[in-house]
């Protein structure tokens, strides 16, 4: 089925929502004053070999559980991330965006990445797809 303007708009809004969530996480943790940043950086994330299409979001989906575990370290009284809710929201968006019709086997790069590199990669991906839709 060819994409309609309404489905393109919906995809764009979902990507913008995903982008905002990822940016919020990054801004919350990537602060040189964050007492836990150095320890958060010891966690490793798998990066996609290729991320150019919505189906590649499968690679993000598979890393959401490790992401939640690291985010459990990021809370403070003035920064209420609520990792479980946040990851759940991201998961819903990812599932809708990538679709469930086709099963895509994610291919990962050989090198692992830190949480900051991981988030930046998926932020760049989201921005790239949004730019092709507008």
């Amino acid at each position: 089925m060819a994409p309609t303007s309404s489905s393109t708009k919906k995809t764009q809004l979902q990507l913008e929502h995903l982008l905002l969530d990822l940016q919020m996480i990054l801004n919350g943790i990537n602060n040189y004053k964050n007492p836990k940043l150095t320890r958060m950086l010891t966690f490793k994330f798998y990066m996609p070999k290729k991320a150019t299409e919505l189906k590649h979001l499968q690679c993000l989906e598979e890393e959401l559980k490790p992401l939640e575990e690291v985010l459990n370290l990021a809370q403070s009284k003035n920064f209420h991330l609520r990792p479980r809710d946040l990851i759940s929201n991201i998961n819903v968006i990812v599932l809708e965006l990538k679709g469930s019709e086709t099963t895509f086997m994610c291919e990962y790069a050989d090198e692992t990445a830190t949480i900051v590199e991981f988030l930046n990669r998926w932020i760049t991906f989201s921005q790239s797809i949004i730019s092709t839709l507008t």
């Epitope: 007492p35 320890r39 010891t42 370290l73 809370q75 009284k77 003035n78």
Partner: antibody, heavy 121, light 111 residues
């Protein structure tokens, strides 16, 4: 019972290599970071570095960078601290400890019993 | 690195005494409303034991006579009524910035 059990006391000569261990039990070893702390005779505590046993990722106190290597083998729930060439000034008690950092906190809640390292010619 | 200065470095006390140990940091150890200051007890030949975390939280299993307070750069560990098993060395530790640092210790001896 959650515990960290360290290897026994070591007596070495300057220039020799050494690897001491810290074995975790009673909890999911890969879910918690392991820290290493030095205590020289009659002195206070100095933080050396940390390892994530799940990923192998490490972070060192600049003072100890290049002096020691921290590693882990998650298959046997064990973290290691090693020296390639010991000096007399490495004589100390070495502790491993478990880092807790969820929520609003960051502290060492479980400690190993310590490993005494004596370096003397 | 953040320097932690404990005072006194040692003192003598009797069982039943109220004991107060202070720890002063060279810069604030607070982050977004939380104080990253912990207290440990160490007895001769033994490993340190966690007493208080995040300035005022009592670790599970630690007697309620131990309490912690403070924020920013000034922190206090109080033992409301000293018991014979409390004679030990006490260390403060900041976990707000790497490298984590410890105070020089306060040795509590029997008078």
């Amino acid at each position: 019972e959650v515990q960290l059990v360290q290897s026994g006391a070591e007596v070495k000569k300057p220039g020799e290599s050494l690897k001491i261990s810290c074995k975790g039990s009673g909890y999911a070893f890969t879910n918690y970071l392991i820290e290493w702390v030095r205590q020289m005779p009659g002195k206070g505590l100095e933080w050396m570095g940390v390892i994530n046993p799940g990923s192998g990722g490490t972070y060192y106190n600049e003072k100890f960078k290049g002096q020691v290597t921290i590693s882990a083998d998650k298959s046997i729930s064990t973290a290691y601290l090693q020296w390639s060439s010991l000096k007399a000034s490495d004589t100390a008690m070495y502790y491993c400890a478990r880092w807790r950092g969820e929520g609003y906190y960051a502290y060492f809640d479980v400690w190993g019993q310590g490993t005494t390292v004596t370096v003397s010619s | 690195a953040i320097r932690l200065t404990q005072s006194p470095s040692s003192f003598s006390a009797s069982t039943g005494d109220r004991v107060t140990i202070t720890c002063k940091a060279s810069q604030s150890v607070d982050y977004q409303g939380d104080s990253y200051m912990n207290w440990y007890q160490q007895k001769p030949g033994k490993a340190p034991k966690l007493l208080i975390y995040s300035a005022s939280n009592l670790e599970s299993g630690v007697p309620s006579r131990f309490s912690g307070s403070g924020s920013g750069t000034d922190f206090t560990l109080t033992i409301s009524s000293l018991q014979s098993e409390d004679f030990a060395t006490y260390y403060c530790q900041q976990s707000n910035e790497d490298p984590y640092t410890f105070g020089g210790g306060t040795k509590v001896e029997i008078k």
